[in-house]
């Protein structure tokens, strides 16, 4: 392995998965590397093989149990190491003492559905997936709506500063096709980041009735 610029980032999904990405400039694509997890107060150790996701980055998931099982708590510390094979030995390339609830990234929201649609309005709901009960209501959401002729990047962000799993989109254009996405973030954790965006939900507003506006 070469001593290029390295980065090792991991996130806990709040239940039973730690996802890690390891990148190193100039590293060989066929280098064999793995992430090893060593908790301070659990009986298990876990390893996952880092698989290439781009020219200089690798990723893997430490699956700690059933998807909805609560495998770690706020007091856990998991020492994470990147180990890469160099000849007959393994070399430690990165190491961190990982506090799961300081490094959260939840799963993308699921089950998006149109509850009610009108000419200018649409009410949409969703669910959060594999989120810890520890959060209670301490979550926030961001949503965006894709209008015709625009890109997702141009879409203004709507912020929901509470655990609200629905939104009423207003000032929409009648008889128009839209797409909608939402993402979630716990309020807890210094290095916590937004979940991936949900799968887009396509919907169409109702056409305006002749002679009146509903």
């Amino acid at each position: 392995a070469v001593n290029g610029t390295s980065q090792f980032t991991c996130f806990y999904n709040s239940r039973a998965n730690i996802s890690c990405v390891w990148s190193q400039d100039g590293a060989l694509q066929d280098t064999s590397c793995q992430v090893h997890a060593w908790p301070d107060r659990r009986r298990w150790n876990q390893t996952c093989e880092l698989l290439p996701v781009s020219q200089a980055s690798w990723a893997c998931n430490l699956i700690l149990g059933a998807p909805d099982s609560q495998k770690l708590t706020t007091v856990d510390i998991v020492t994470l190491r990147v180990l890469c094979r160099e000849g007959v030995r393994w070399r430690v390339m990165a190491i961190q003492d990982f506090k799961p609830f300081e490094n959260l990234r939840l799963m993308a929201p699921i089950s998006l559905q149109v509850v009610h649609v009108e000419t200018h309005r649409c009410n949409i709901s969703w669910e959060i997936s594999q989120a810890s009960h520890y959060f209670e209501r301490h979550l926030e959401f961001e949503a965006r709506t894709l209008s015709p002729g625009h890109t997702w990047e141009e879409a203004p962000l709507l912020t929901l500063k509470q655990k609200q799993e629905w939104i009423c989109l207003e000032t929409l254009t009648p008889d128009t096709q839209y797409e909608f996405q939402v993402r979630v973030k716990p309020l807890q954790g210094e290095f916590t980041t937004w979940s991936p965006w949900s799968q887009p939900l396509a919907f169409r507003t109702k056409p305006a009735a002749l002679g009146k506006d509903t």
Partner: nanobody, 126 residues
Framework: QVQLVESGGGLVQAGGSLRLSCAAS????????MSWVRQAPGKGLEWVSS????????DYADSVKGRFTISRDNAKNTLYLQMNSLKPEDTAVYYC???????????????????RGQGTQVTVSS
């Protein structure tokens, strides 16, 4: 704002011991890996040792391995370097440094720090 203040340096005879301390403030200490680096007179910065956020991982430069011990007390927001069997070539200004995240990279341990203290002078006489 992030502050790192070293103390514990001084003049000591070869074979003696010193314990350096680094008081940290302005950030959640346990969330960051830390290190000690040193600068001898007329030389560049030399990495000495690194430690993970809860002390479960440590690394040392070959020149100090077996003589120096890095540790931390997260309740006191303090990093330590216990220096035993000191040699004249250990004479330097010693700095504590914070890595920019909870991670450090053993093959390139001098990289990735974002804050450093003002340093404390260690002089080892023969």
């Amino acid at each position: 704002q992030v502050q790192l203040v070293e103390s514990g340096g001084g003049l000591v005879q070869a074979g003696g011991s010193l314990r350096l301390s680094c008081a940290a403030s302005g950030f959640t200490f346990s969330n960051y890996a830390m290190s000690w680096v040193r600068q001898a007179p007329g030389k560049g910065l030399e990495w000495v040792s690194s430690i993970t956020g809860f002390g479960r991982g440590t690394d040392y430069a070959d020149s100090v391995k077996g003589r120096f011990t890095i540790s931390r007390d997260n309740a006191k927001n303090t990093l330590y370097l216990q220096m035993n069997s000191l040699k004249p070539e250990d004479t330097a200004v010693y700095y504590c440094a914070r890595y920019s995240s909870s991670t450090y990279y053993p093959p390139t341990p001098a990289r990735g720090t974002d804050y450093r203290g003002q340093g404390t002078q260690v002089t080892v006489s023969s």
